[in-house]
């Protein structure tokens, strides 16, 4: 029950996180004009990964897309790439985790397969979250660097009479959305990985069995089942050899736990 809850919660948290990463990537407010120097401006600038916008106090907003690819800063391209990779990995992770959910029954899929998929999706969520956090952090670092550079060159002109105020940009809402979303995706991924451990069938210490064949006694040592960690080739938990022998554990093992998803 705790495993199902952990897995389900991990899925929901990751889902919210990935939705947040998508939202942050699409948002225009990655950087917003710093109004400290000119709080009464009638024109407010803000920029996203894909376009820059100008909002006038009249309510009129004009946005222009970055129609060049080669002319954009390498850092911006890197941030775009990180966010897209984060979204793609997150989306695949979500798809995998849907099938891995313990509460959803798909054919005769066994726990080991679900554990495998849960771990895979968990790792994907972790990487997705890290990509988003990295992307947002790179952009934030870029902003901080530019902010102090523009502050150093804030005023130029003849004896300070004419002030050419450089537009400084500060953190926009998208950065905070991205950080939170990345964190949620990361947490969701960790929860999925934790749930995976609970889903994986534990190795059973099977008791020794006696196999009687034409008068000879052959003692089979425990380990008739190959213990599955979810990564072994024998994922179906079939006996390596079954010549009609039965362990004491198996006698009353109906219905098997593998019959339930």
């Amino acid at each position: 029950m705790a495993v199902t809850a952990c897995q389900g919660l991990g899925f929901v948290v990751s889902l919210i996180g990935i939705a947040g990463i998508i939202a942050a990537t699409c948002m225009d407010q990655w950087s917003t004009q710093d109004l400290y120097n000119n709080p009464v401006t009638a024109v407010f600038n803000y920029q996203g990964l894909w376009r820059s916008c100008v909002r006038e106090s009249s309510g009129f907003t004009e946005c222009r897309g970055y129609f060049t690819l080669l002319g954009l800063p390498a850092m911006l391209q890197a941030v775009r790439a990180l966010m897209i990779v984060g979204i793609v990995l997150g989306a695949i992770g979500l798809l995998v985790s849907i099938f891995a959910l313990k509460c959803i029954r798909i054919g005769s899929m066994e726990d080991s397969a679900k554990a495998n998929m849960t771990l895979t999706s968990g790792i994907m969520f972790i990487v997705s979250g890290l990509c988003a956090i990295a992307g947002v952090s790179v952009f934030a670092n870029m902003l901080v660097t530019n902010f102090w550079m523009s502050t150093a060159n804030m005023y130029t002109g003849m004896g300070g009479m004419v002030q050419t105020v450089q537009t400084r940009y500060t953190f926009g809402a998208a950065l905070f959305v991205g950080w939170v979303a990345g964190g949620l995706t990361l947490i969701g991924g960790v929860m999925m990985c934790i749930a995976c451990r609970g889903l994986a069938p534990e190795e059973t210490n099977y008791k020794a069995v006696s196999y009687h064949a034409s008068g000879h006694s052959v003692a089979y040592k425990p380990g008739g089942f190959k213990a599955s960690t979810g990564f072994g080739s024998n994922t179906k938990n079939k006996k390596i050899y079954d010549g009609g022998a039965r362990t004491e554990d198996e006698v009353q093992s109906y219905p098997s736990k593998h019959d339930y998803v």
Epitope: T41, A42, V54, S57, T167
Partner: antibody, heavy 118, light 113 residues
Framework: QVQLKESGPGLVAPSQSLSITCTVS????????VHWVRQPPGKGLEWLGV???????NYNSALMSRLSISKDNSKSQVFLKMNSLQTDDTAMYYC????????????WGQGTTLTVSS | DIVMTQSPSSLSVSAGEKVTMSCKSS????????????LAWYQQKPGQPPKLLIY???TRESGVPDRFTGSGSGTDFTLTISSVQAEDLAVYYC?????????FGSGTKLEIK
Amino acid sequence: QVQLKESGPGLVAPSQSLSITCTVSGFSLTSYGVHWVRQPPGKGLEWLGVIWAGGSTNYNSALMSRLSISKDNSKSQVFLKMNSLQTDDTAMYYCARDFTTATGFDYWGQGTTLTVSS
Amino acid sequence: DIVMTQSPSSLSVSAGEKVTMSCKSSQSLLNSGNQKNYLAWYQQKPGQPPKLLIYGASTRESGVPDRFTGSGSGTDFTLTISSVQAEDLAVYYCQNDHSYPFTFGSGTKLEIK
């Protein structure tokens, strides 16, 4: 066609309040902003404030404490209220239309003369 | 507040002559976000309200004769009348549209000889 017409009291005693109405036609106040500008006799233009299409206002900081701009979209009227009038508030008061900040005040009213005198 | 300084304060020219008047702002009126200059020019004839001539520093308002040209960027702006006509007798104001309050210059009075 686009028209703006100011109407005011003409003469006001010092320390009294002023209310000027700008009645517009040919456009909607839900699409355009309206600015108030005054011009003392023989002097230059002074911007007082604006009410934008959405209802937000901005004022000249020097007059903000005694200035108020409001509007009634259904009546196509914009109101300028100013209190604690002094003799140096004597001026021609204009209302002007503006679509966006970048496009200037494209239509002006003929103005209304205000004299502050006892 | 942004201070708008106009020069000269007045000038007298003959009809047909070219006229140039200057407007300087204490802060840049160029917005980096859209590369627009938030400056307008107005013409005020005696006994009349001001009339918009130029907005965005260089865009001529519809109906304005093409002899009126606005130029400049940042803090330095110019209004040029290529061939002055008798009806151009007026006071010309520049205005900051970038930051509140939307300050006007003191004006340049154009007189015809």
